[in-house]
């Protein structure tokens, strides 16, 4: 197989602002124990690795991005949460190996969240929806 077809992924993935998206990347036999990563930027050599596995199947989370490898199925799953418009970009699913890493591009697009009735209201008071989010943040801190 050519270097590029050792790993495959979706060409494009679409997410909703403030929502989450999941990307599944599939690799060929032999790469199970290698580190997998998710990186951002159209130019391969300069893409910024956002999250990387530890070599096991344990999920690794950094900020709003997580990665989990399923070595039996030879797939790894990347989840991006609390999506923002600025998350739209070119990303790579990758496998770390000696010499050249392996990778495949995934274009991530973010659609605006549907505007709710609460958000169109001119009232400056905090809605339950906003309070909910704030409460979650307080619980996390």
């Amino acid at each position: 197989y050519s270097i590029v077809t050792q790993i495959t992924g979706p060409t494009t993935v679409n997410g909703l602002e403030r929502g989450s998206l999941t990307v599944q990347c599939v690799y060929r036999s032999g790469w199970e124990t290698y580190l997998k990563w998710w990186c951002r930027g159209a130019i391969w050599r300069d893409c910024k690795i956002l999250v990387k596995t530890s070599g096991s199947e344990q999920e690794v989370k950094r900020d709003r991005v997580s990665i989990k490898d399923n070595q039996k199925n030879r797939t790894f799953t990347v989840t991006m949460e609390d999506l923002m418009k600025t998350d739209a970009d070119t990303y790579w699913c990758g496998i770390e190996k000696t010499g050249n890493d392996l990778g495949v591009t995934v274009q991530v697009t973010i659609d605006p969240a549907p505007v709710t009735q609460e958000e169109t209201s001119s009232s400056p008071t905090l809605t339950g929806h906003h309070l909910d989010n704030r409460h979650k943040l307080l619980k996390l801190s």
Partner: antibody, heavy 119, light 112 residues
């Protein structure tokens, strides 16, 4: 086969605007960033920057910030270089170039577009 | 910016001779990922540049094995073991490790 075909030679006056095109064929246009390179007459090559052909976001080298603009017409698999308020020092041949998948060098180049700036 | 200095400016050779072109960078061009993105291009009169070597020493597909690249850190060399007529033109080194990416000034390979 993969080709980058650029628009023909341009003759413009100082202060005018020019738009050079680079039409790609033989591959999925949005999968590969497009780079631009300048070559002044009798001089060497200068990397100008690149554009993400999927998102349309451009990145410019410092010397090409301001009057230079990279853009796309994705439906036509075409990248553009626009130069505003032309100056004599813009007189050059401009190349579009594509890197290989793993960005190991510019392996495809347009034939170049010669821009002459003269009053 | 990383300054790429090529020597000599002009290199007169006889066909069949070995040619050697040097390229020196003003700072290390080892990328943060550990790779060195040093490339060599040949531009023949009236043509677009053509990629010969990438990542210091890797020949691009279709490039004859008489071309070889070497070096590390800040000092790099392109060697042509037996110069042929089709090799004549201007050779440029290029660094793609640090933005802005930069080319050397060029070395003109010509017949003695």
């Amino acid at each position: 086969q993969i080709q980058l075909v650029q628009s023909g030679p341009e003759l413009e006056k100082p202060g005018e605007t020019v738009k050079i095109s680079c039409k790609a064929s033989g591959y999925t246009f949005t999968n590969y960033p497009m780079h631009w390179v300048k070559q002044a007459p009798g001089k060497g090559l200068k990397w100008m920057g690149w554009i993400n052909t999927y998102s349309g976001v451009p990145t410019y080298a410092d010397d090409f910030k301001g009057r230079f603009a990279f853009s796309l017409e994705t439906s036509a698999s075409t990248a553009y270089l626009q130069i505003n308020n032309l100056k004599n020092e813009d007189m050059a041949t401009y190349f579009c170039a594509r890197m290989d998948y793993y960005s190991n060098g510019f392996n495809y180049w347009g034939q170049g577009t010669t821009l002459t700036v003269s009053s | 910016d990383v300054l790429m200095t090529q020597t000599p400016l002009s290199l007169p050779v006889s066909l069949g001779d070995q040619a050697s072109i040097s390229c020196r960078s003003s700072q290390s061009i080892v990328h943060s990922n550990g790779n060195t993105y040093l490339e060599w291009y040949l531009q023949k009169p009236g043509q677009s540049p053509k990629l010969l070597i990438y990542k210091v020493s890797n020949r691009f597909s279709g490039v004859p094995d008489r071309f070889s690249g070497s070096g590390s850190g800040t000092d790099f060399t392109l060697k042509i073991s037996r110069v042929e007529a089709e090799d004549l033109g201007v050779y440029y080194c290029f660094q793609g490790s640090h933005v802005p990416w930069t080319f050397g000034g060029g070395t003109k390979l010509e017949i003695k």
